[in-house]
Each structure stands twice: as C-alpha cells, then as structure tokens.
C-alpha cells in the first residue's frame, strides 16, 4: 500500500503567441481546482475509462477576478497536494490524466457551474520511494507545471511497496526465516499479509494482498465450500470417486453489481463497491453530477450538487453528444453553396467561395456582367461566376477588343491558302480539293464527293466561307 502524490506548481499561459483569454472575468469570478486520474501500465485508454489506480480532486483555489486589459497570469492555485492512495502494489509504470477545472462563482442561484479548462495526459515509469519527478505539460495555449512521486505507507517498503518491514524485536537478529530489510537494516521483513478477510483456515498467500484457496474451498476470501458432484473430467483428491469439485454458488457469482461495480462477499451476503457516479445496493442508480466532471472538450456543466440532480453539458462549437464527447464534422452537411470549399476551424465554420460568389455560405451570385462592357458589339454572358464576352465576327479576346485574324488557326485543309475577308475568311484550295475549307477531294473523273459545284465556280477556284 502507498500514496501517489501530485504537487501543482503553476497553471497559466504557455510560451509563444496566442495567449489564452483569462478564464475569469469581473462579472464571472472563478476559481480553479484539479483532478488527477491514474491507471496502471502504459495504457492508451480513453479519458473516460475508469481510473483503476485511483483518482483525487484538489481543494478549490482562491477566487480570481481578471484585471481588465491585463494578460492572463499564472492563476492562483489550491493549497496542498493531491493524494491518490493505492491499496495494492505500485505498478511501476502508470498513465495519468490531470484536468484543470474552472468553477464559476457568479450570482448563480442553482449553485456553481463547472467547466474543463485543460486536460493533460502522459505515461511514465516511476519507482516508489524515489525523489519527486518534475514535469511540464501543455494543453492548447495553457501550461501546467507539476511534480509527482509514489511513496509506500509503513510497513510497506520497496520500489513496488510489496515488502513489509517491522522494527526488530531483538537487537541482534531477525526472527526465524526472516531477513533484514534493506536499506533499513535495523528492521526485519515481516510475514506476508494476505488480502483482508482471507480465511486463516482455508486460505493462504504467496504475494501480499492475495488470497489463494486450499483444496475444497473457493471464493475471493476462500470462505465458500465447493460441492462434490459427478462430472466428466475428474480433478483433485476426489477423482477416485469419479466425481470432481465444483464451486458452490457464491453470492458474487455472475457479479450482481451493475455499471462496473466490484463485488465482495460479506458473512451474510455481498457488497458492491460502486464506481464514481453510481450508488445503490447494486450500483444501479446513476448519480453523476457536475462535481464528477462529466463534460468533455471544454463543455460547461450545468446541474445541482445533489446526486439526484440532472446535469447537462453546454457544448462548445464543433462538439456534440450528451457529454460533448463527439466531434462534429460540420462540413459533412455541405453548408457551402455554389461549389464553395468548407473549412471547419473548430471555433467556427468558413466557406472559401469560388470566383463570382460571396457570402458566409457562398450564397450570393455576384452579377458578373455588372459594369463590364464587351467592345465592338460583343454581348456579355454570365455564368459559373466568371463573365464571358460573345464577340462579333472578326473580334476576339476577353472583352472583344482584339481584332481576330481568321487565318491564325490555319483553317484551310490540304494546303489551301487562307485569305482574310471583311466577312470572314476565304480558302483558295490546292488542285484536287474543294469545299469551304478545302476538305473534300475531287474525284479523278471530275466528279466530286459533294453535289456539283455551284454554277460559275470550277473546282480549284477560291471558295468564300460565309
């Protein structure tokens, strides 16, 4: 057994640009408190998973009111350590979550409102009994500085708090079979202490805190006799009778405790140890209140302090769910019109509009032709957010200001020569070809692939393209 201790040194704006807004104001003074959650091993568990090693809440810090115009300083902290007692061995590797909470102290009739300001998490190796370890963690624009250590509670010693020591009864040596307790040479290793309540007649232990049963007994405390009945695979001393040992029904069989409660046997029945937020004989009653910090992602908790009180989480933009636990993909609703690009910035939604469109959701179609004249008799055509001029014959370019060279694109096929003409272009076809663009070959017998040429035109004569 032992205690994990956490000392918060400072909580305030981190280095660099973008200092956070002070969490308190003259109208809404507030104070801070901290919550630590510990889990064994180097788990990557979600913040909502149980704090299997334990959790602790700090006291409330001094009331703080922002000075108008002043940058957010390091905020006043609660006094004292956060202490998380652990009953069993210290695991050596652990995961932590440290949350900084804001308690608003306005003239709220229904009691204070809580909201999560910052959450930091990490995974560390730590031997019990060692010195304080210092750490700095950042959450957004906030910075948290803290120290932590794990220490064993007497009589436990060692890096895992599993060895037990007692002062020597005799000055010269330890009792039979017991070694001196390094580094405390003036103390002796004590006999193992089994799990509390472990039956002294039917149970024993090889590690502190465990309870292993002798043949014929079962249950967490070895207090339940096993019944003998016939079965297929004989086991234990009764195999000679072709029977086997089957545990009798225990009060904790099937775990009667709901919502993750743990069951322990009592002389008469069972007892449920309920996780935080649940109560009742079988942990069947949910009593989550704002004090349990149920709102995630900066959600503001609203609710009374009574376990029967409801609570709701007022969620910041970009989050939803009863605990603000779900990130909203607001762009999936395709809020940007006319092909605009959607950007979810977390605190707000932005639409990047295509040319010719404007407005928060690109809903306004700009009049592309407004104030734009097409020269030389061209007409303006609106469409797709970009204006376009349909130019009169002989003119081109964006605004029809350029005189078009109809021969620039080499429109006459099969070596025909192109001549610019006031009404367009004329192709003078090479021998053997005819047509407006010299595209048709003339057959050797004088017939063509087209109806006969109009009167007055011989094959090979220039043909005007109208």
């Amino acid at each position: 057994a032992g205690v994990f201790e956490l000392q918060i040194h400072s909580f305030g704006p981190g280095p660099g640009p973008g200092a956070p807004r002070s969490p308190c104001s003259a109208r809404l003074p507030c104070r801070l408190f901290f919550r630590v959650c510990l889990k064994p091993g180097l788990s990557e568990e979600a913040a909502e998973s149980p704090c299997a090693l334990g959790a602790a809440l700090s006291a409330r810090g001094p009331v703080y009111t922002e000075q108008p115009g002043a940058p957010a300083p390091d905020l006043p902290l609660p006094d004292g350590l956060l202490q998380v007692p652990f009953r069993d061995a210290w695991p050596g590797t652990f995961s932590f979550i440290i949350e900084t909470w804001r308690e608003e102290l306005g003239d709220q009739i229904g009691g204070p409102a809580w909201s999560l300001l910052a959450r930091v998490a990490g995974r560390r190796r730590l031997a019990a009994g060692g010195p304080w370890a210092r750490d700095i963690q950042r959450a957004g624009a906030w910075e948290l500085r803290f120290s932590y250590r794990a220490r064993c509670e007497p009589p436990a010693v060692g890096t895992a708090c599993t060895r037990l020591c007692r002062p020597r009864s005799a000055p010269s040596r330890c009792g039979p079979g017991l070694r001196p307790c390094a580094p405390l040479e003036d103390e002796c290793e004590a006999p193992l202490v089994c799990r509390a309540g472990c039956s002294p007649e039917h149970g024993f232990c090889e590690q502190p805190g465990e309870c292993r049963c002798l043949e014929g007994w079962t249950g967490p405390l070895c207090t339940v006799p096993v019944s003998t009945s016939s079965c297929l695979s004989p086991r234990g001393p009764s195999s000679a009778t072709t029977g086997c040992l089957v545990p009798g029904p225990g009060p904790c069989d099937g775990n009667p405790c709901a919502n993750g409660g743990s069951c322990s046997e009592t002389p008469r029945s069972f007892e449920c140890t309920c996780p935080r937020g649940f109560y009742g004989l079988r942990c069947e009653v949910s009593g989550v209140t704002c004090a349990d910090g149920p709102c995630f992602n900066g959600g503001l908790c609203v609710g009374g302090a009574d376990p029967d009180s409801a609570y709701i989480c007022h969620c910041p933009p970009g989050f939803q769910g009863s605990n603000c636990e779900k990130r909203v993909d607001r762009c999936s609703l395709q809020p940007c019109r006319n092909g605009g690009l959607c950007l979810d910035l977390g605190h707000a939604l932005r639409c990047r509009c295509r040319a010719g469109f404007a407005g928060p959701r690109c809903e306004h179609d700009l009049d592309d032709c407004a104030g734009r004249a097409c020269a030389n008799g061209g007409t303006c055509v609106e469409g797709g957010g970009a204006h376009r001029c349909s130019c009169a014959l002989g003119f081109g370019g964006r605004d029809c200001r350029e005189r078009a060279d109809p021969c620039a694109a080499r429109p006459c096929a099969h070596g025909g020569r192109c001549y610019a003409h006031f009404s367009g272009l004329v192709c003078a076809c090479a021998p053997g070809y005819m047509g407006a663009r010299c595209e048709f070959p003339v057959h050797p017998d004088g017939a063509s692939a087209l109806p006969a040429a109009p009167p007055g035109l011989r094959p090979g004569d220039p043909q005007r393209y109208l």
Partner: nanobody
Framework: EVQLVESGGGEVQPGGSLRLSCGPS????????VGWWRQAPGKQRNLVAG???????NYAQSVKGRFTISRDNAKNTVYLQMSSLRAEDTAVYYC?????????WGQGTLVTVKP
C-alpha cells in the same frame, strides 16, 4: 435585465399531471442550453430536466419516465410535461437558460401535490 417567465404551476392531486411553460422569450434560442430546476422548502435547488445546446436531454433520477422536457425554437418556449405527480414533487419550479457567457432565471412557479 431580461427575465424568463414561467406559467402552468398550481395544485394537483397525486397521480395528476401539469404542463409548465417558459416564455416566449428572445432568450430561448437554439444556441442556449435550457432546463427546469426545482427547490423544495429547506432543500437546495436541483436540475430536474435539461436540454443542451446540442439537443441532448437529461433528467433527474427521481423524475425519469414521468417528466418530459421539450423546446419549441420557433415559439422561443420551453415546456415541462409532468405526469404521475407525487407529494415529493412539491416545489417551486424555475425556468433556466444559459450560454457560455450568461445565465438567465425565471421567478419560479409553485407546484403543489397534495390529496
């Protein structure tokens, strides 16, 4: 300062029903979380039912299955439908709304459940 106005309270027999209304008020908009609190004599005020700004509802354990909270954003009004009323539901019921910056309360309406 703008206040919320409750109506619909009164005296009712055990097992009876009442419907409380709050509003209309320009305060009750879809971006606010709204709720009904109650305070019995000598007890602290507790949230009976609430609807968050993202539409999640929650109820006190003691009223689940009996009370229903709803909101009409078009009418800027919040309702609390109470049925199977019990003596322990006797209290002053307060309408409530809040955003991140401000919170708003009504003056309260008395609900009395007695045979």
């Amino acid at each position: 300062e703008v206040q919320l106005v409750e109506s619909g309270g009164g005296e009712v027999q055990p097992g009876g029903s009442l419907r409380l209304s709050c509003g209309p008020s320009e305060i009750i908009t879809s971006d606010k979380s709204v709720g009904w609190w109650r305070q019995a004599p000598g007890k602290q005020r507790n949230l009976v039912a609430g609807i968050s700004n993202v539409g999640s509802t929650n109820y006190a354990q003691s009223v689940k299955g009996r009370f229903t909270i709803s909101r009409d954003n078009a009418k800027n009004t919040v309702y609390l439908q109470m049925s199977s009323l019990r003596a322990e539901d006797t209290a002053v019921y307060y309408c409530y709304a809040r955003d991140f910056e401000n919170e708003y309360w009504g003056q309260g309406t008395l609900v009395t459940v007695k045979p």
